[in-house]
């Protein structure tokens, strides 16, 4: 392209080097927080995440500073303000430190923000073939359409009674239940 | 707390007909469950009527009850039994019951009383 | 789909065993998908042990069940007066079918 060093190529008090070989004729050596090969691109601080705990980061050019989620503060979000305190989880489900938000863990059957809420673990209809699912305390639980067997209803059975089962694992049964 | 309460029970006339209704409080059908009907005579053992699964809807019928009885959930906490062409041999106590998983009935109302006679 | 109940009825001394045996005309879903329960006069049946062998919770441990298939058998082991009750079998079977056994009466003396 014909650019040197004398042009002043480099941007943002980048030092411009004289190329070694005739394909670049010069070099950018850049400062800090400056990028590129022009030294034209400011470096995103922020891309390494430097915010712990879901932290928002601000590059302030001269500074980084780390907006904090509720929970938590430090200078990197780091320092977890005991968001369980005070805080009840219904239904069996016990409080769990972390994520910058009081956050439950339910109970099987539970669900919601506090565990409040029933869940249906047979919302997502995993009995295969038209079988029943039932969300037994154990687990849920699948009871097969004739004609078909396994825990998760996904294995046809012969008409002389074998099933198509490969190599079962010990104990597969129809509806035994999904932990 | 989990609990069912059956009502529309009472003295019906031969060939009558008769509606049961089965409230759930503490759950809704919003889960899968076999919702069932089960009945009692004075002195007698349980008998299964009917169920109907929340999760689709779907019903089963013991092979007697086939054509006189009919099964459905009138709202996501209420199910019904409508009897029809009701017999002196009908006269008994039914329950609701449901089934939440294992085929066992885990949990039951306290049953209302249904006497035929004319 | 019969499910037949024997002995009735049954009498057993406090603290004796009592064993009721429960047989049915076809196998259960499962092998194992057979339940007991015990009732009193003016009460809905109460469950006991479901998938032949589990105990409910709440139910003391002098209930078990056993068997599989289309044979089974309630043991009360260290029978209580408060045991005196009829006890029912309940099987599901293949294509979503309830049964009832048709009773044991328990007397403790």
């Known amino acids: 392209s014909g650019v040197t060093c004398a042009d002043g190529p480099c941007f943002n008090g980048g030092l411009c080097v004289g190329g070694a070989d005739p394909d670049s004729a010069y070099i950018c050596h850049c400062p800090p927080g400056f990028q590129g090969s022009n030294c034209e691109k400011r470096v995103d601080r922020c891309s390494l995440q430097p915010c712990r705990n879901g932290g928002l980061c601000l590059d302030l050019g001269h500074a980084l500073r780390c907006r904090c989620r509720a929970g938590f503060a430090g200078p990197r979000c780091e320092h977890d303000l005991d968001d369980c305190a005070g805080r009840a989880c219904a239904n069996g489900g016990t409080c769990v430190e972390g994520g910058g938000a009081h956050r439950c863990s339910c109970a099987l059957g539970f669900g919601g923000r506090d565990c409040r809420e029933r869940a249906d673990p047979c919302a997502a209809r995993p009995c295969a073939h038209g079988g029943r699912c039932y969300a037994h305390f154990s687990g849920l639980v699948c009871a097969c359409a004739p004609g078909y067997m396994g825990a998760r209803c996904e294995f046809p059975v012969h008409p002389d009674g074998a099933s198509a089962l490969p190599a079962a694992p010990p104990g597969l049964r129809p509806g035994d239940p999904q932990r | 707390q989990e609990q069912l309460v059956e009502s529309g029970g009472g003295l019906v006339q031969p060939e009558g007909s008769l509606t049961l209704t089965c409230t759930a409080s503490?759950?809704?059908?919003?889960?899968?469950?076999?919702m069932c009907w089960v009945r009692q005579a004075p002195g007698k053992g349980p008998e299964w009527i009917a169920c109907?699964?929340?999760?689709?809807?779907?019903t089963d019928y013991a092979s007697w009850a086939k054509g006189r009885f009919t099964v459905s959930k009138a709202s996501s906490t209420t199910v019904t039994l409508q009897m029809t062409s009701l017999a002196v041999a009908d006269t008994a106590t039914y329950f609701c019951?449901?089934?939440?998983?294992?085929?066992?009935?885990?949990?039951w109302g306290p049953g209302t009383l249904v006497t035929v006679s004319s | 789909q019969v499910l037949t109940q024997t002995p009735s009825p049954v009498s057993a001394a406090v603290g004796g065993t009592v064993t009721i045996s429960c047989q049915s005309t076809?196998?259960?879903?499962?092998?194992?998908?057979l339940s007991w329960y015990q009732q009193k006069p003016g009460q809905p049946p109460k469950v006991l042990i479901y998938?032949?062998?589990n105990l409910e919770i709440g139910v003391p441990s002098r209930f078990k069940g056993s068997g599989s298939g289309t044979q089974f058998t309630l043991t009360i082991s260290g029978a209580q007066c408060d045991d005196a009750a009829t006890y029912y079998c309940?099987?599901?079977?293949?294509?979503?079918?309830?049964?009832f056994g048709g009773g044991t009466e328990v007397v403790v003396k």
């Open positions: 019951a449901r089934n939440s998983g294992y085929g066992y009935f885990g949990l």
């Open positions: 503490g759950f809704s059908f919003s889960s899968s469950y076999d």
């Open positions: 109907i699964y929340t999760g689709d809807g779907s």
């Open positions: 076809e196998s259960v879903y499962g092998s194992d998908w």
């Open positions: 998938q032949a062998s």
């Open positions: 309940q099987g599901y079977y293949s294509g979503y079918i309830y049964a």
